[in-house]
Every structure is written in C-alpha cells, then in structure tokens.
Interface confidence: medium
Amino acid sequence: LQDLCSNCPAGTFCDNNRSQICSPCPPNSFSSAGGQRTCDICRQCKGVFKTRKECSSTSNAECDCISGYHCLGAECSMCEQDCKQGQELTKKGCKDCCFGTFNDQKRGICRPWTNCSLDGKSVLVNGTKERDVVCGPSPADLSPGASSATPPAPAREPGHSPQ
C-alpha cells in the first residue's frame, strides 16, 4: 500500500484528482524526478541561445550560445558577447587591453603582465595585448662563470679508497 503519488515515475506528475493517479507530462513540460505534483515547463532556447539538447518528458532542454557569444552561469543561464583576444568586454562593448595587460581568450578581462623581477627573473619575450610576457633566467644566472660545465666531484669519506 505504497503512497502511489510519491512514487509517480519521472516523466509523469501526480494528477490524483482525475481518473489516473499519475499522468504523463503534457507537451513542452518535464519531470526529472519521481513524485512530482506538477511538471516543469521546458526551457526554450531562443535569441542568442541555441538548443544543445531537446526537452524530453524526463529532462529539460539544454542551451548553448550562438556563434559570437559564450555561456555564463549555471546551465548556460546567460550568453555574453565574445571579444577578440587582446580585448575585454565593457559596458560600452569590446575594448582593447590597456598597455601592461593582456587577454588570451575571447572572454574574461584583461590581466596584468607577469612581473618577472618579482621572481628575480628577466623578461625573455615581451608581452602584448594578447600574450603575457615570458620570463627567462635571472641576469645573475647568465653572468660568465656562474655555471660550470662539469659538476664538482663528490667528497670522499675518510678511510675509504675509491672503488
């Protein structure tokens, strides 16, 4: 004598006041879990959204963004305009990254170049609007005599002859 309403399967809802206890979800609606009192309206992928997965009686539609936009938020709840590499999106549209900053993606904000000197390194490749700087070895590492071609021989322990 199970509580049948609580056991209506996914894809149905408890329509207990009619002749059936569980009724199939109407068109353009779904229930992804059992025991639902109502079915949820299917998401519609319109405008800047495009359909990635159609709605079924047991699962909601899934949306992507049309070309030139990218998804933001859980389950692609928003579409944000793409910018070019070397740009960031502002309220006034896409703007070039300021000097000293870069963005290597079509989304997100411009970030400052890495400060190589903070790690005691030198700039090997200069940064651009699209690319971060590449840090190289520190100037000290490059000075003559700083590195030896042959590593020093290990010290022998006293009382042991070489093998």
Epitope: C5, S19, Q20, I21
Partner: antibody
Framework: QSLEESGGDLVKPGASLTLTCTAS?????????MCWVRQAPGKGLEWIAC????????PHYASWAKGRFTISQTSSTTVTLQMTSLTAADTATYFC??????WGQGTLVTVSS | AQVLTQTPSSVSAAVGGTVSISCQSS???????FSWYQQKPGQPPKLLIY???TLASGVPSRFKGSGSGTQFTLTISDLECDDAATYYC????????????FGGGTEVEFK
C-alpha cells in the same frame, strides 16, 4: 508511532457503523497515505480505501466499496471509515495502515441478525 | 477490477530450504507498485518487500522479491521456523478506483 482501530461492534444487517483509526506519534495534518484493509474470519486480505491526510486529494476506493464506504480524515490524529447498508459479508477484522508499513491490531465488525 | 492470482495456496517446506511464491496480475502493475506481506495468526500484516524488490526495514535478506509487469515472485531461502506464516502479494494500479488488489495468500508450513 502506533495506530489503533476502534468502533468495531456486533450490528444487524442494514445498519451503519463508523470505525476510527487513532494515531500516536503521527500528525495527520501532514501528508500521509492512510488505508483501510479488512480480513474476513479465516480469509485473505481485502483492500477497501486509502486517503491522503492533510490534503484535498481524491481518496482511492475499491469499486465494491465506493458509495457504501467513506474514508475521511476527521482530526489531526484520526481517520475514519463510515460503512452503510452492512451485510453478513462485511463481517471481518478491519485494519488501518499507514503506507503499508505501519498497521493497527484491527477491530472486529460482526454483522448478524 | 484487477485480480492477483497467487500460487501455490499452501506449501510445506523444510527448515533450511527455499520456497518460491508466485503472483500473477490480470493487469500490468504500474511502475513496480508491488509489495509482499507476511501475516501470522492474530497479528496484522507485516511489510516485507515494496517496489517489487526493495527490502523493508529490518527484513532479513533471505527474503527476495523479483518480477515486473504482471508476474512477480517472492523467494524465501534458508527457511527458519519463524517464517511459518501466510504471505500476501499486493499490486498497485494507476487508477483512483481499484488502486490496489491483494493476492489470495500462500500459507507456508513446515514438514
């Protein structure tokens, strides 16, 4: 948590009787699926009706019981079964149950002239 | 109304043995709304299995429910003396009238 049936009696054919299922430790203002089942002496189980407590949902009935038997929630601790036009065939122990997992001990109804 | 035909009506078993009880429904049970109950004389029924194969709380794993649609089986293995009882199947149907039906019962006794 427990259920106790009461109201069972010896009645004459054609009489009416109301059985009460009283719950301890269960609040029927919340949603529970409460059922009545009967068992004639030496016979098997026979489902009568079920109701959602704390709800206006349609009760569920056996076709033979609909119209003559009425299940209802009468308080936050009681569910009743009203029976009319009783005949000898209604002689049985009447059980109430919560979703099949919790049962009362039953109350005996005897219909005899 | 739906009819559940339970077979056999009685079975004589040996301690440590296995018994199987079948239940056939005149209509397909909806979404595995199917249960098995155990009843001993002078006691109310006790839920053993629900949703066709899910063991109720506190019921030993010697009890196993299987089946779907119109055909269901209860298997009791490693039988103990305490298993002597009458077993009932119950089916649930997707209608507000005749929502449930019980099988006629199977009495399990020991040789």
């Amino acid at each position: 948590q427990s259920l106790e049936e009461s109201g069972g009696d010896l009645v004459k054919p054609g009489a009416s009787l109301t059985l009460t299922c009283t719950a301890s430790g269960i609040d029927f203002s919340r949603r529970y699926y409460m059922c009545w089942v009967r068992q004639a002496p030496g016979k098997g189980l026979e489902w009568i009706a079920c109701i959602y407590t704390g709800s206006r949902d349609t009760p569920h009935y056996a076709s033979w019981a609909k119209g003559r038997f009425t299940i209802s929630q009468t308080s936050s601790t009681t569910v009743t079964l009203q029976m009319t036009s009783l005949t000898a065939a209604d002689t049985a122990t009447y059980f109430c149950a919560r979703e099949g997992s919790l049962w009362g001990q039953g109350t005996l109804v005897t219909v005899s002239s | 109304a739906q009819v559940l035909t339970q077979t056999p009506s009685s079975v004589s078993a040996a301690v440590g043995g296995t018994v199987s009880i079948s239940c056939q429904s005149s209509q397909s049970v909806y979404s595995n709304w199917f249960s098995w109950y155990q009843q001993k004389p002078g006691q109310p029924p006790k839920l053993l299995i629900y949703s066709a194969s899910t063991l109720a709380s506190g019921v030993p794993s010697r009890f196993k429910g299987s089946g779907s649609g119109t055909q269901f089986t209860l298997t009791i293995s490693d039988l103990e003396c305490d298993d002597a009882a009458t077993y009932y199947c119950a089916g649930g149907y997707n209608t507000v009238i005749d929502t449930f039906a019980f099988g006629g019962g199977t009495e399990v006794e020991f040789k």
